[in-house]
Interface confidence: low
């Protein structure tokens, strides 16, 4: 339904607080380098303008699109060219090209300082002194570092952030109360950001059809009692929401997400029996809860899939009449019967089925041709099952840190051209699959592990896209969204790689390592491990283990020494020499 003033419509729907928060997120995700104060000023100006349009929708400029209004506002930033270089050229374009231009300049790895957490008392004072500014700062800092963060969900995180400070700043032991909550929000936030990044990559790189297929599979697993028509409606609405958020249309996205939550709760009887608790919550919690809700129980006595999709003589007729609808029904029926499969496996099965029908429906005897199509699924199902079994065994044997190290070595040998920080970050996250998923029973392992790996490998893909250094990474990332993980799993050692020259500086460590947290110390050691593999890609596991054990002992010894710096200098030289000898460098 058309509105005379889009900005007034969204302001009224969302309310002033959410409107301001979402505009701040939008601006921070576009202009990631701009100071907080500049963004607040822009947001206040937009908000004042929106209020004039609420008062009179016919007022000057109130009929302009949100992209036009927001783009014009962003283009008033005085230092645009100095700070953003060529991004300033976006301002010479007209909508919709201007917005597309801004989107293309979003940086997944912006040059921003690491967020350092101040002392608890300092934070509590800042929170009490100016709660509004404190919370805006949170939105700004997260949004600029995560330019694809799902904006309505970030509002939910901010609400929890506020609740944590409200509760803990009054507690007897503020730190004991607050720090675990902030750690949890940080970890959940990173996971949420990465999951949304995959959704946006799916839409932007592989198109709406790919995203809809993913959504059909996931919603069918989650709501197996819902009719196909109901799942299709939810998929259409969900696709609209994510298309908007990934496109920077955050006000529309948040508004449509609220409408979708309302619809789901009004129709929960025909969707899922698991929604009752979610639907009793306030809006932000409700939407989050629905997105995370557990799978409903499968209906009893579901008939065999073969009857409709293999044995029926009408398979080719049905397929020809409406290909995507028929394939959607296949995916729906298969997914609702298999909550134990990953979404990407279900999509591989659907792709195999589609390829078979394309070939067989043009054959002399179609039925004879596709009769054994389900037999082709067996190896596709067994491959992730076996991989997860092997890797969970390895994880249980090694523990998380050493399992990460095994993956670091594995992936550095596969794609040694990738920068060391990226290899460390991605391999550490890949390694977290163990503690996240291996504890689950067999029936939940694959959806947990393989769909999580899809999220992590997408991080590698988006970082690599900015700096393409490996044809193998480009190939695995771009050929097929659902086959990314099997593609990376299948990569062997890159025999074409010319080992990096040895640089002693890379392996020089100082006393500052002693004051690092355990996590940061691990990252230092893992960075050294990647560099070792880049210098000596043919090093055996045993050689690398020996060097890393020596390195751990060296750090432990020097951190206990009276003169730490001298110890690091002298023992470090010996360690480098011993490592070179051990690895034949």
């Amino acid at each position: 339904d058309a509105h005379k003033s889009e900005v007034a419509h969204r302001f009224k729907d969302l309310g002033e607080e959410n409107f301001k928060a979402l505009v701040l997120i939008a601006f921070a995700q576009y202009l990631q380098q701009c100071p907080f104060e500049d963004h607040v000023k822009l947001v206040n100006e937009v908000t004042e303008f929106a209020k004039t349009c609420v008062a009179d929708e016919s007022a000057e400029n109130c009929d302009k699109s949100l992209h036009t209004l927001f783009g014009d506002k962003l283009c008033t930033v005085a230092t645009l060219r100095e700070t953003y270089g060529e991004m300033a050229d976006c301002c010479a374009k007209q909508e919709p090209e201007r917005n597309e231009c801004f989107l293309q300049h979003k940086d997944d790895n912006p040059n921003l300082p690491r967020l350092v957490r101040p002392e608890v008392d300092v934070m509590c004072t800042a929170f009490h002194d100016n709660e509004e500014t404190f919370l805006k700062k949170y939105l700004y800092e997260i949004a600029r570092r995560h330019p694809y963060f799902y904006a309505p969900e970030l509002l939910f995180f901010a609400k929890r952030y506020k609740a944590a400070f409200t509760e803990c700043c009054q507690a007897a032991d503020k730190a004991a109360c607050l720090l675990p909550k902030l750690d949890e929000l940080r970890d959940e936030g990173k996971a949420s950001s990465a999951k949304q990044r995959l959704k946006c990559a799916s839409l932007q790189k592989f198109g709406e059809r790919a995203f809809k297929a993913w959504a059909v599979a996931r919603l069918s697993q989650r709501f197996p009692k819902a009719e196909f028509a109901e799942v299709s409606k939810l998929v259409t609405d969900l696709t609209k929401v994510h298309t908007e958020c990934c496109h920077g249309d955050l006000l529309e996205c948040a508004d449509d997400r609220a409408d979708l939550a309302k619809y789901i709760c009004e129709n929960q009887d025909s969707i899922s029996s698991k929604l009752k608790e979610c639907c009793e919550k306030p809006l932000l919690e409700k939407s989050h809860c629905i997105a995370e809700v557990e799978n409903d129980e499968m209906p009893a006595d579901l008939p065999s899939l073969a009857a409709d999709f293999v044995e029926s003589k009408d398979v080719c007729k049905n397929y020809a009449e409406a290909k995507d609808v028929f394939l959607g029904m296949f995916l729906y029926e298969y997914a609702r019967r298999h909550p134990d499969y990953s979404v990407v496996l279900l999509l591989r099965l659907a792709k195999t089925y589609e390829t078979t029908l394309e070939k067989c429906c043009a054959a002399a005897d179609p039925h004879e041709c596709y009769a054994k199509v389900f037999d082709e699924f067996k190896p596709l199902v067994e491959e992730p099952q076996n991989l997860i079994k092997q890797n969970c065994e390895l994880f249980e044997q090694l523990g998380e840190y050493k399992f990460q190290n095994a993956l670091l070595v594995r992936y550095t040998k596969k794609v040694p051209q990738v920068s060391t920080p990226t290899l460390v970050e991605v391999s550490r996250n890949l390694g977290k699959v163990g503690s996240k998923c291996c504890k689950h029973p067999e029936a939940k392992r694959m959806p947990c592990a393989e769909d999580y790996l899809s999220v992590v490998l997408n991080q590698l893909c988006v970082l690599h896209e900015k700096t393409p250094v490996s044809d193998r990474v480009t190939k695995c990332c771009t050929e097929s969204l659902v086959n990314r993980r099997p593609c990376f799993s299948a990569l062997e050692v890159d025999e074409t790689y010319v080992p990096k020259e040895f640089n002693a500086e890379t392996f020089t460590f100082h006393a500052d390592i002693c004051t690092l947290s355990e996590k940061e110390r691990q990252i230092k050691k893992q960075t050294a491990l990647v560099e070792l593999v880049k210098h000596k890609p043919k090093a055996t596991k045993e050689q690398l283990k020996a060097v890393m054990d020596d390195f751990a002992a060296f750090v432990e010894k020097c951190c206990k020494a009276d003169d730490k710096e001298t110890c690091f200098a002298e023992e470090g030289k010996k360690l480098v020499a011993a490592s070179q000898a051990a690895l034949g460098l």
């Epitope: 380098q33 060219r81 100095e82 700070t83 953003y84 270089g85 060529e86 991004m87 300049h105 940086d107 790895n109 912006p110 040059n111 921003l112 920068s419 060391t420 920080p421 970082l463 900015k466 700096t467 250094v469 500086e505």
Partner: nanobody, 126 residues
Framework: EVQLLESGGGLVQPGGSLRLSCAAS????????VAWFRQAPGKGREFVAG????????YYADSVKGRFTISRDNSKNTLYLQMNSLRPEDTAVYYC???????????????????WGQGTLVTVSS
């Protein structure tokens, strides 16, 4: 810490070509925004061309657009400036500068670059 070492400068006739190189050590060049600046006698440092960290988006000063090309070879950890159709007003000491942390953009502001080479002299004269 990033060390930068320029080479390739020299004397060239108007209309001629030169290729400047800037070898980086201490950090991968693909992880930094890098740029060429120049300083003519008695003038301030002027931005010539830049390339983003983590993405090959290039930027040029209007005065060199269409004549100069900036590129980098990640495997050699080296930045290049191919200069064609050189003019006498291109005479200057050319510096390469780096801004680590994978900034997508390069800035034309010299003071945002913490690392600089020692410079290489380019003279365009008949």
């Amino acid at each position: 810490e990033v060390q930068l070492l320029e080479s390739g400068g020299g004397l060239v006739q108007p209309g001629g070509s030169l290729r400047l190189s800037c070898a980086a050590s201490g950090r991968y060049i693909d992880e930094t925004a890098v740029a060429w600046f120049r300083q003519a006698p008695g003038k301030g440092r002027e931005f010539v061309a830049g390339i983003g960290g983590g993405v090959d988006i290039t930027y040029y000063a209007d005065s060199v657009k269409g004549r100069f090309t900036i590129s980098r070879d990640n495997s050699k950890n080296t930045l290049y400036l191919q200069m064609n159709s050189l003019r006498p007003e291109d005479t200057a000491v050319y510096y390469c500068a780096a801004r680590p942390g994978r900034p997508l953009i390069t800035s034309k502001q010299a003071d945002l670059y913490p690392y600089w080479g020692q410079g290489t002299l380019v003279t365009v004269s008949s």
